[in-house]
């Protein structure tokens, strides 16, 4: 089976402030199992911004049907964006487990925001 | 409005156990990494411990061994078990929010533990 | 484990002086140090983060500088309800999060 990889394409994203910004993300495999997660920053504290399995989350929707077992495609878009969400966004790759562990995250995706236009 | 309540604080001699309880409201517990921070009387504040997101632990070396940091999300409740307990773990502590900078933008009011003979 | 020294230890200012102090790591953090601002009994409130970006509702009289190991908290006009205990904190990306002594502000 092909080593899973994980693709961000877009170093960076620049997004208007009220507009929604979408963040790509492909897998290369569907093994192993387990879900993707989406965080904003890296580390101990990086923020939890959608998890395929809890949620809701209010301003985050996944571009495609990420509940077909056969998706590759885990984009998500972030729905009126602020000043507040700018960061780097990284796409996670967890294994099924008894707690999920991380197995492999994406390059990560800068984003920045421009002040609304007038 | 984010709140952050801590309880189970209380006088204890030294080697006995205490555990502390944090109650989180107004923001999406599961989501964020959590801290705790003690105080000693007079003193500055020392980092104790934190637990990100998705359950992985990091203590201070001065509680490695002593203190573990636990989460339930269904609860919004952070916890704090101390074994072990010294004099010199005397402190108010307090429990924070924990941003994706690495800061604490959110803090509770302290729950204040005493060790002593 | 990154050292935070702050100095001076306590500071004595009249109301409406401007008030600095400063807070040095024992090695580069970047531009990642924080200020925090306590008052008696209550716990410690969040004022600047990445060394001088103002957290939600800070007013602007407050202000952070430096990069590197040498950072300095600016208090432009100092108002009644800023006499408290300032403490700088380093927020690399990873733990031990440590904090200076802190910085005591009082009337003078």
């Known amino acids: 089976e092909e080593e899973l990889q994980i693709i961000q394409p877009d170093k960076s994203v620049s997004v208007a402030a009220g507009e929604s910004a979408i963040l790509h993300c492909t897998i290369t495999s569907l093994f192993p199992v387990g879900p993707i997660q989406w965080f904003r920053g890296a580390g101990p504290a990086r923020v939890l911004i959608y998890n395929q399995r809890q949620g809701p989350f209010p301003r985050v929707t996944t571009v495609s049907e990420t509940t077909k077992r056969e998706n590759m495609d885990f984009s998500i878009s972030i729905s009126n964006i602020t000043p507040a969400d700018a960061g780097t966004y990284y796409c996670i790759k967890f294994r099924k487990g008894s707690p999920d562990t991380e197995f492999k995250s994406g390059a990560g995706t800068e984003l920045s925001v421009r002040a609304k236009p007038s | 409005d984010v709140q952050l309540v801590e309880s189970g604080g209380g006088l204890v001699r030294p080697g006995e156990s205490l555990r502390l309880s944090c109650a989180a409201s107004?923001?999406?517990?599961?989501?964020?990494?959590v801290t705790w921070v003690r105080q000693a009387p007079g003193e500055g504040l020392e980092w104790v411990s934190l637990?990100?997101?998705?359950?992985?632990?990091y203590y201070a070396d001065s509680v490695k061994g002593r203190f573990t940091i636990s989460r339930d999300n269904s609860k919004s409740t952070l916890y704090l078990q101390m074994n072990g307990l010294r004099a010199e773990d005397t402190a108010v502590y307090y429990c924070?929010?924990?941003?994706?900078?690495?800061?604490?933008?959110?803090w509770g009011l302290g729950t204040l533990v005493t060790v002593s003979s | 484990e990154i050292v935070l020294t702050q100095s001076p230890g306590t500071l004595s200012v009249s109301p409406g002086e401007r008030a600095t102090f400063s807070c040095r790591a024992s090695?580069?953090?970047?531009?990642?140090l924080a200020w925090y601002q306590q008052k008696p009994g209550q716990a410690p409130r969040l004022l600047i983060y990445?060394?001088?970006t103002r957290a939600t509702g800070i007013p602007a009289r407050f202000s952070g500088s430096g990069s590197g190991t040498e950072f300095t908290l600016t208090i432009s006009s100092l108002q009644s309800e800023d006499f408290a205990v300032y403490y700088c904190?380093?927020?690399?990306?990873?733990?031990?999060?440590?904090f200076g002594g802190g910085t005591k502000v009082e009337i003078k």
């Open positions: 924070a929010k924990v941003t994706w900078k690495n800061v604490f933008d959110y």
């Open positions: 107004g923001f999406t517990f599961t989501n964020y990494a």
């Open positions: 637990i990100s997101v998705t359950g992985t632990t």
């Open positions: 090695q580069t953090v970047g531009s990642k």
């Open positions: 990445d060394a001088n």
């Open positions: 904190q380093q927020h690399t990306d990873w733990p031990p999060y440590t």
